[in-house]
Interface confidence: low
Amino acid sequence: TPEVWVQVRMEATELSSFTIRCGFLGSGSISLVTVSWGGPNGAGGTTLAVLHPERGIRQWAPARQARWETQSSISLILEGSGASSPCANTTFCCKFASFPEGSWEACGSLPPSSDPGLSAPPTPAPILRAD
């Protein structure tokens, strides 16, 4: 069964800056990755970045840099802005659309015990939805 993992890290040098890393553990071909915050995309969350293997990368503030790390993983740097920046319990979700597996999504947030700059290893997060 395909899985999606999500890792959230707060940068030590800039406490309102987050790095989100997501990966797809499956054999299919990825056609689209959507990163959102505040809940799953389409369920109260809002899109931060869309990564398409051919059409390119689209991002919205406070996303500062979205990029492919490998053919099946991406990373996104978020830049916070004072009171309205992401906080430690903000939920980030990644949705991978792949063929033939379909759409798989998982969410994660900063581990509660994390010190800035530290994070748990990128273990698979619970899969919220498979379309």
């Epitope: 915050w37 899109t47 689209r58």
Partner: antibody, heavy 120, light 107 residues
Framework: EVQLQQSGPELVKPGASVRITCKAS????????IHWVKQSHGKSLEWIGY????????GYNQKFKSQATLTVDTSSTTAYMEIRSLTSEDSAVYYC?????????????WGQGTSVTVSS | DIQMTQSPASLSVSVGETVNITCRVS??????LAWYQQKQGKSPQLLVY???NLPDGVPSRFSGSGSGTQYSLKINTLQSEDFGTYYC?????????FGGGTKLEIK
Amino acid sequence: EVQLQQSGPELVKPGASVRITCKASGYTFTDYNIHWVKQSHGKSLEWIGYIYPYNGGSGYNQKFKSQATLTVDTSSTTAYMEIRSLTSEDSAVYYCAREEVRRDEALDFWGQGTSVTVSS
Amino acid sequence: DIQMTQSPASLSVSVGETVNITCRVSENIYSNLAWYQQKQGKSPQLLVYGASNLPDGVPSRFSGSGSGTQYSLKINTLQSEDFGTYYCQHFWGTPYTFGGGTKLEIK
């Protein structure tokens, strides 16, 4: 009827701060981003930033990030923009506008504008 | 940041003529572009979104087209109420910059 009602004109001294309000009505406040746009006299439009009322998420034009702060009060469906350390360069009309979140990206309704004059 | 270059900066035309305004973008924005009309002393109003879609209430004499880095707004059979300043704006990653504007004046 969708309305974005902005606060009245402001005359402020250099170095001071100003807070502009944008009261939204006629739609679900948390379904739309609120954007702020600056227009200096006789000039083009400059995008300042936006705020997402659902979770307070915001994005700024780097040019304005250190000077402007965007906030919302969902209970009163009001968006606010505070601008600090004002100079004559900040004299302009400021607009709020809404954008349906990640749908048809465009600013489909605008406030009437708030004129800010910075003068000693 | 993405740069938006609008042309012409101003245009003097007569009622009944057809007008084309162009917006050149510094990189591919995949049709994520809006056009606005602003009349003197008023707020901008949305004319076109997604490069070619008209919101409800916008007259069909307005049309938007383009893709990649080149977009245009066409006004057929210009009416007296069409005079004003027109702006393009991209929505391909922040900041969502505007073009410099095209002022449409009566000849």
